[in-house]
Amino acid sequence: LPAQVAFTPYAPEPGSTCRLREYYDQTAQMCCSKCSPGQHAKVFCTKTSDTVCDSCEDSTYTQLWNWVPECLSCGSRCSSDQVETQACTREQNRICTCRPGWYCALSKQEGCRLCAPLRKCRPGFGVARPGTETSDVVCKPCAPGTFSNTTSSTDICRPHQICNVVAIPGNASMDAVCTSTSPTRSMAPGAVHLPQPVSTRSQHTQPTPEPSTAPSTSFLLPMGPSPPAEGSTGD
């Protein structure tokens, strides 16, 4: 004969646990139904009546099967430097992520607590490591034979053009100026993508970034020596 199916609420066998989507109510000492995502427990179960669930109100949610008396509040609206990548619904919290050109300097469980603008490498410096959603740009000085004349969070050091006759030699922040009308480009433009520039002058090489034990979520951008606009908090 098939085992008899117990309907909630029911007293569990000694030593056994309640089934999936049920919880043990200490007061009633019964296995009772949990509420589904998007709902909460309006009335707790008794020995004779099961949990009464109700839908979450606007701007509140429950993501899991639960028996909480109140739904959780959705986070505040996304700040100006963030975009809403997941809306607040009865079943899920709002998620804010940093908008393009920014990265998450301080993360929270879901989304970002502090967004900050990606570092812009000044002329003479190029991007050694691009920014990501959770890490800032890393800049490096342009090695001999390469240059960057922009202030940019994306531009790498590019090779100087090779001239038949040089009018003005290039440097780290300026391309070479040729007198001839048909300059040729440098042989190995791919070299500028290397994290450590290859250089014949050892004093001009930049150390390869070394990994460290610190978390890889961070930053912001100083404008002069005063503190930068401190990014924004999205709670």
Epitope: A105, L106, L114, A116, R119, K120, C121, R122, P123, G124, F125, R129, T134, S135, D136, V137, V138, C139, K140, P141, N171, A172, S173, R201, Q203, H204, T205, Q206, P207, P209, E210, P211, S212, T213, A214, P215, S216, T217, S218, F219, L220, L221, P222, M223, G224, P225, S226, P227, P228, E230, G231
Partner: antibody
């Protein structure tokens, strides 16, 4: 108000270890690159180590490379300098400094009050 | 490594004097040069950055000039509170070295 407060200095024997800490407040810690700079008694300034805001990039002076490790805890707003295999020439006041925002704003704009490390037998 | 040669190592001057300190680098540092002031027993303080830009709260009697490998800090009219040691520094490739310092003393 930006504040950087170093701690952990003291007297240590040659070959010993010490860990310096720097508690930061008054700014968005996780968005700034940080460094350690030292000054031997009666001498000039010497840059020691740098860590970028996310802890991805660390650079060291040749005099401490392989012996010192810079790290940070952005959740605790704290910068660290683990100093191993200490030598007499490491005796100095160690300053925790904010900056450089390397490649973009190249300077040290705030300095702690310093903590004295003395390496002597 | 980039060598920083700061001169003079010390100088004596009177209140109201114009004071000039120079810093020469062994290769171009593209104006990635700050100047700091340090008083005895105190931490250094940023005076100028990018060779010529005045840091916040620094009096206008301080000025900087230079490019490439040659840089100058000028105090147009020395004040009693300016007696201190001054350091230049480069932020080109690592290691980021400081000049050896210039001590400005009262004549």
């Amino acid at each position: 108000e930006v504040q950087l407060v170093e701690s952990g200095g003291g007297l240590v024997q040659p070959g010993g270890s010490l860990r310096l800490s720097c508690a930061a407040s008054g700014f968005a810690f996780s968005t700034y690159d940080l460094s350690w700079v030292r000054q031997a008694p009666g001498k000039g300034l010497e840059w020691v180590a740098y860590i970028n805001n996310g802890g991805i990039s660390t650079y060291y002076s040749d005099t401490v490379k392989g012996r010192f490790t810079i790290s940070r805890d952005n959740a605790k707003n704290t910068l660290y300098l683990q100093m191993n295999s200490l030598r007499a020439e490491d005796t100095a006041v160690y300053y925790c400094v904010r900056g450089p925002f390397y490649g973009s704003a190249n300077y040290f704009d705030y300095w702690g009050q310093g903590t004295l490390v003395t390496v002597s037998s | 490594d980039i060598q920083m040669t700061q001169s003079p190592s010390s100088l004596s001057a009177s209140v109201g004097d114009r004071v000039t300190i120079t810093c020469r680098t062994s290769e171009s540092i593209y104006s990635n040069l700050p100047w700091y002031q340090q008083k005895p027993g105190k931490a250094p303080k940023l005076l100028l950055y990018d060779a010529t830009k005045l840091a916040e709260g620094v009096p206008s009697r301080f000025s900087g000039s230079g490019s490439g490998t040659d840089y100058t800090l000028t105090i147009s009219s020395l004040q009693p509170e300016d007696f201190a040691t001054y350091y230049c520094q480069h932020f080109w490739v690592t290691p980021w070295t400081f000049g050896q310092g210039t001590k400005v003393e009262i004549k």
